[in-house]
Structure formats: C-alpha cells, structure tokens
C-alpha cells in the first residue's frame, strides 16, 4: 500500500548502555480513528467527533505493523522481527536497545472498510542513540520502586536531571493509556497502592531549527513493601528430634520464610555436626514454594539414601540467612522402637 499519505511522527530513543531497558511505539492513528482502536482516546464521552471516516473494529490487536527497510525494499511484516520486537494490542515493544532498531515503522488498521481508510496509517521514524557520558550522571532508572502505603514519585528518566521549572511539558502513559492530568517530569503519588504498578511511558518534544522529535522513555514501576527488619524464620523442622527406621531412605525438609528485601540473597543450607566436626552437605537446589508481596518461603531438602547407626550420633542442622541475620534448627535422629 502507498504510505505517502500516512501521518508522520519522529521519535528518539536514547538508551543507557548500562541498563536493560525497553521501548514502545503506540499506533497513534489520527484522532477520530484512534478511539475505535487503542482505547487511548483523549476525548471525553461527550466530545464525539463530527465524523468518523474510519469505521474500525474494537479489537485492540486489530492493527498491523510494518517495518520499512532502509534500502527501499517493500514493507516487511513486523512479525519477521520476532522475538526482538513484539506487538501487544496497538503497541510495539522493543526488547533490546540498539541503533539497529532505528528506522521507519508503519501501523495501520488490518481491516480496510472504506476508501478513507487507505490513508489511515501512521509512519514513525525512530532514531536510536546510546546515551553519551556527558548526559546526566544521575538520571532516573528505567526500573523504579514505589513503597506501598507511603508517598512516592515516578521520574521520567530522560528529564530527571532538569528542575521542574525548566522541564518541558511531558505526556505520560500508564499501560498504554494516557494520563491526561500529568504534565510534569515527575508523577507524585500521595499514597501508593498495588494498582500504581505498571509500565509508564513519558514523552516530551525536543525541537531544533529543522524539525521536532518526541523523546520517549519507558519506566517499569514496581510496588513493593519495605525491606524486612527480621531475620528469616524456620517453619520446618519444628521438632529437634525425628524418629527414623535404620536402613531406610530419609528426606528431611527445611522450610524457611524470608521477608521481602529489594536486594534478595537468601541462604538456606544443611550441614552436619558429628562430635567436634561439622561440614556442609551437598543437597538438591533450594526451591521457592510460596511467594507473596511480603515474604517468600524457600525449601531445601537433605536426602539420606539409607539411615545408618552413625547418623543417629549426628546432628543435622538447617542454616538460613538474610541480610539481617541467621537462624538455625538442628535435628537429632532417633531410632523408632
């Protein structure tokens, strides 16, 4: 199809070589058409456009994305670029930063239902550049955390070095939907709830004498609880003696609850004490058996192929540790009578 009639938008993605960040393109079809598509309609229900030339579908994934090869070859279906570029609803997600993502991307409805619809398309010229070291040293991260129940803020990474006074007007999106009231380089959250978690996009316009570009950044915002102030506790074994049968195989499970920590490095291991000696046992990998917002339960088993008389003289110790401290629980084996 002829893309000369498509509306054009220029975007700039300046990525940090230090972080694993992603980027998105929205299918910004001309305003009346957009309302049929991506549900990012800026119109209030009362502001119905006078005419709707594009009779699109309500199916959110009903747009087609293409990539325009730089050598002038025909347009390529974006699905050829899978899994580096992924379409979700009307949004194109770029999973890996790199200058090779620079180029032209075209979106249009899949279903062309009237002569007007042929020109119902958008061409996005994307320029991708690595961030120069000269730019801001302390720019906001592309992964930001908000503490549940407290106040917090979400900063636009590409503008975080500028003061609110000198910052240009910013357009914010959350999970692809326009946040129409937010216009500054920082979103202030009075009280953080779980629903504040999501993918935020901030856009602002940068102009030079020749043209203007939309500078875009993507921020993944996580809602978290505060770091625990407690060392882990062992939920199992509870008893310090265990009745066993000699000659039979035995599995002893150690289950421990670890409170949430942003930097989470849990330790759970088994060791054996035999008179004055003690040594760590090679046991199967630990596994997470339950994970909630506040804590995680991790299990690690020690397996004895068969219980011997010598095992009855030993103590089997489960050791767990986080950044706050450690806890141990020892088990003495006792022959079943």
């Amino acid at each position: 199809f002829n893309i000369s009639g498509c509306s054009t938008k220029k975007l700039l993605w300046t990525y940090s070589t230090r972080s694993e960040e992603e980027f998105v393109l929205f299918c910004d079809l001309p305003e009346p058409q957009k309302s049929h598509f991506c549900h990012r309609n800026r119109l209030s229900p009362k502001q119905v456009p006078e005419h709707l030339p594009f009779m699109g579908s309500n199916d959110l994934s009903d747009v087609q994305w293409y990539q325009q090869p730089s050598n002038g070859d025909p347009l390529e279906d974006i699905r050829k670029s899978y899994p580096h570029i992924i379409q979700d609803k009307c949004t194109l997600h770029f999973l890996t930063p790199g200058v090779n993502n620079s180029g032209s991307y075209i979106c249009r409805p899949k279903m062309i239902k009237s002569p007007y619809d042929v020109a119902c398309c958008v061409k996005m010229i994307l320029e991708v550049k690595p961030q120069t070291n000269a730019s801001c040293e302390y720019s906001a991260s592309h992964k930001q955390d908000l503490l549940l129940g407290s106040t917090g803020s979400i900063s636009c990474p590409s503008l975080s070095c500028q003061s609110d006074a000198q910052s240009p007007a910013v357009t914010w999106y959350k999970n692809g939907k326009l946040l129409s009231v937010e216009r500054s380089n920082r979103i202030v959250v009075d009280e953080v709830y779980d629903y504040h978690q999501g993918t935020y996009v901030c856009d602002y316009t940068q102009s030079d004498t020749v043209s203007s570009w939309t500078v875009r950044a993507v921020v993944q915002v996580r809602t978290i609880v505060g770091d625990t102030k407690l060392k882990p506790d062992i939920l199992d074994p509870v008893e310090d003696t265990l009745e066993v049968e000699l000659g039979k195989p035995l599995t002893i499970s150690c289950k421990a609850r670890f409170g949430f920590e942003r930097v989470f490095n849990p330790v759970i291991k088994w060791y054996i004490k035999d008179s004055d000696l003690e040594w760590e046992v090679s046991v199967p990998e630990a596994k997470s058996i339950k994970s909630t917002l506040k804590d995680e339960i991790i299990e690690r088993n020690i397996i004895l192929e068969k219980v011997t008389q010598r095992d009855l003289r030993r103590k089997f110790v489960c050791f767990v540790q986080n950044s706050i401290g450690n806890t141990t629980q020892s088990v003495q084996l006792k022959e079943k009578r």
């Epitope: 694993e20 994934s61 899994p83 992924i86 379409q87 979700d88």
Partner: nanobody, 117 residues
Amino acid sequence: QLQLLESGGGLVQPGGSLRLSCAASRSITFSHNVMGWYRQAPGKGRELVSSIGSGGSTNYVDSVKGRFTISRDNSKKTLYLQMNSLRAEDTAVYYCGVVVGVYRGSLGQGTLVTVSS
C-alpha cells in the same frame, strides 16, 4: 517478587501432544504483561518460543508455528502452551516468563519435555 510455577512436562512419543501450564502469584502483574514460553535444549541457549500479549495477540518462532498454541486466562493468572505434533528437537526444559512488563526476565523453575520413542 513474582513466582511462576510450570507443570505439564513429561515424556512423550514423537507426534504426541502435551499441555503446559504456568500459574503466577500476582494477578496485577500477570494481566498487564506480555507473557511467554522459553525453552532451553541441552547444550543450547534459551530461546523465546512463543508469547501472548495482554490483548491476546500471539507470536511464535518459525519452528513451532502451526504445532504450538499459546493461551492465557487472566482470571486464573495462568498461561498455557498446547504442544502438538511434537518432535525430538522439541526436547528441552520449558520455562514460563514475563517477556514485557514490570517483572520482565522473571522465569519459573522449568518443566522438562522429552520427546523420544
């Protein structure tokens, strides 16, 4: 923290079928993300086999197109992979993970699929 737990792997003969499931621990995280199935064959790197967007759009690598079907149930916080016409080269550990979103990079512990006669 997001926990993903896969199930449904096993030993199957060439041409057979399996259905993998993956349960997530947080619904707020699950529904807005592009979720996917990765696999890692012995001695090879991990590859993204298929993904599904929050709106239901699906993608597959060429080697599984027409044989594998990905689906999701947001109300149950569960991701599925229906694998038909399985081949020996599909043998791998299959992981469910977040492809795009807040917990991008989070993976389950994996479920082994072995295709052998």
